[in-house]
């Protein structure tokens, strides 16, 4: 299987929440005998690997954030830790996993990682990555909305967020 | 809150076979990754026994396999270390843990312990 | 199997100084960028309590003065200024291959 990135960049004004969002592709085994692990991060341009490098996300590490279920299921963070930092990451059955931050902060502008591990017994991985840029701005210049950019053109959308 | 909690005879005899139970609460073990048994003699450093999945598959430590069986009874959220031809030298405190994943793999909860003494 | 050697087998230190815990491994338990290593902290008729995993990542409840380095076959378990309750046997894990295995342990006590 492969992730993908629908959008590769979203511009979003300051005190707006968005929604960043992976989604796996291909066969997905739904055996019982496999279980998923997915996560976000933060990360940096300029690695010879991207996402190689795995920092916090508002203090919230990688482990804070994951998400751990069969591939029958769906599954979110119900974490009061991750909700008192704005944040909740989500999957459903389709194969999207997403991050929501509320009241974004210039802070929050930077490189973003979704990561998914394949597990199997015993103890064997598959580990697949996606990564997408957030900019946040203030000021005149700022959009009213977020914009996103979709990942195979240049042509960008705007959207409401929730 | 994920509590395990060993159980099983503390004294057993030389030939004998070692049967114990380690209950689960607050954790399913058929929606966790593995659900394993370690064992530490007197004074000594700890040492893997072997685990079975949430799938039902199981994995031995070699030097013990063919002596060993982990089953498990999900109705009772349950999983049996059973451990054949028992030994003086099979003294130890007995634990079974799960298994998380973060870039390693590493026992995140544990059992209070079940100490077994191998005597005649 | 993988042998996990520590050193040493016991420290004396007191409150508030500085612990450094080895652990060196027989091959390298990295995979993908990650150590598969971990360290455990056990006191006297006590399970053995996760402490850091994955070389450097420290478990949720944790105190920071805890931290963990290093990569292939050298890792270090820190303890930047010893609590009285610090004071136990630490043992370094890895979970690179089977068997998973333990190292001897470093006892840790009151200087």
């Known amino acids: 299987f492969k992730v993908a990135t629908p959008y590769s960049l979203y511009v979003c004004p300051e005190g707006q929440n968005v929604t960043l969002t992976c989604r796996l592709l291909g066969p997905v085994d739904k055996g019982h005998d496999v279980t998923f692990y997915k996560t976000w991060y933060r990360s940096s341009r300029g690695e010879v690997q991207t996402c190689s490098e795995r920092r916090p996300i508002r203090n919230l590490t990688f482990q804070d954030l994951h998400l751990h279920h069969g591939g029958h299921q769906a599954a979110n963070t119900s974490h009061d830790l991750a909700q008192r930092h704005g944040l909740e990451s989500a999957s459903d059955h389709h194969g999207n996993f997403s991050i929501t931050m509320r009241n974004l902060t210039l802070l929050d502008s930077g490189l973003y990682c979704c990561l998914v591990v394949e597990i199997r017994h015993h103890h064997s991985e598959h580990r697949v990555h996606g990564a997408m840029e957030l900019q946040v701005q203030t000021g005149k210049d700022a959009p009213s909305n977020c914009v996103v950019y979709p990942s195979s053109s240049q042509d960008s959308e705007n959207i409401t967020a929730a | 809150q994920v509590t395990l909690k060993e159980s099983g005879p503390a004294l057993v005899k030389p030939t004998q076979t070692l049967t114990l139970t380690c209950t689960v609460t607050?954790?399913?073990?058929?929606?966790?990754?593995?659900w394993h048994w370690i064992r530490q003699p007197p004074g000594k450093a700890l040492e893997w026994i072997g685990d079975i999945h949430k799938s039902g598959s199981t994995n031995y430590n070699p030097s013990l396999k063919t002596r060993l069986t982990i089953s498990r009874d999900t109705s009772k959220n349950q999983f049996v270390l059973t451990m054949t031809n028992m030994d003086p030298v099979d003294t130890a405190t007995y634990y079974c843990a799960r298994d998380y994943y973060g870039f390693s793999w590493y026992f995140d909860v544990w059992g209070q312990g079940t100490t077994v003494t191998v005597s005649s | 199997d993988i042998v996990l050697t520590q050193s040493p087998a016991t420290l004396s230190l007191s409150p508030g100084e500085r612990a450094t815990l080895s652990c060196r491994a027989s091959?390298?338990?990295?995979?993908?960028?990650?150590?598969?290593m971990n360290w455990y902290q056990q006191k006297p008729g006590q399970a053995p309590r996760l402490l850091i995993y994955?070389?450097?990542n420290l478990e949720s409840g944790i105190p920071a003065r805890f931290s963990g380095s290093g990569s292939g076959r050298d890792f270090t378990l820190t303890i930047s200024s010893l609590e009285p309750e610090d004071f136990a046997t630490y043992y370094c894990?890895?979970?690179?291959?089977?068997?998973?295995?333990f190292g001897g342990g470093t006892k840790l006590e009151i200087k």
């Open positions: 994955g070389a450097s």
């Open positions: 607050g954790y399913s073990i058929t929606g966790g990754y593995n």
């Open positions: 894990q890895q979970s690179i291959e089977d068997p998973w295995t």
């Open positions: 091959q390298s338990v990295d995979y993908d960028g990650d150590s598969y």
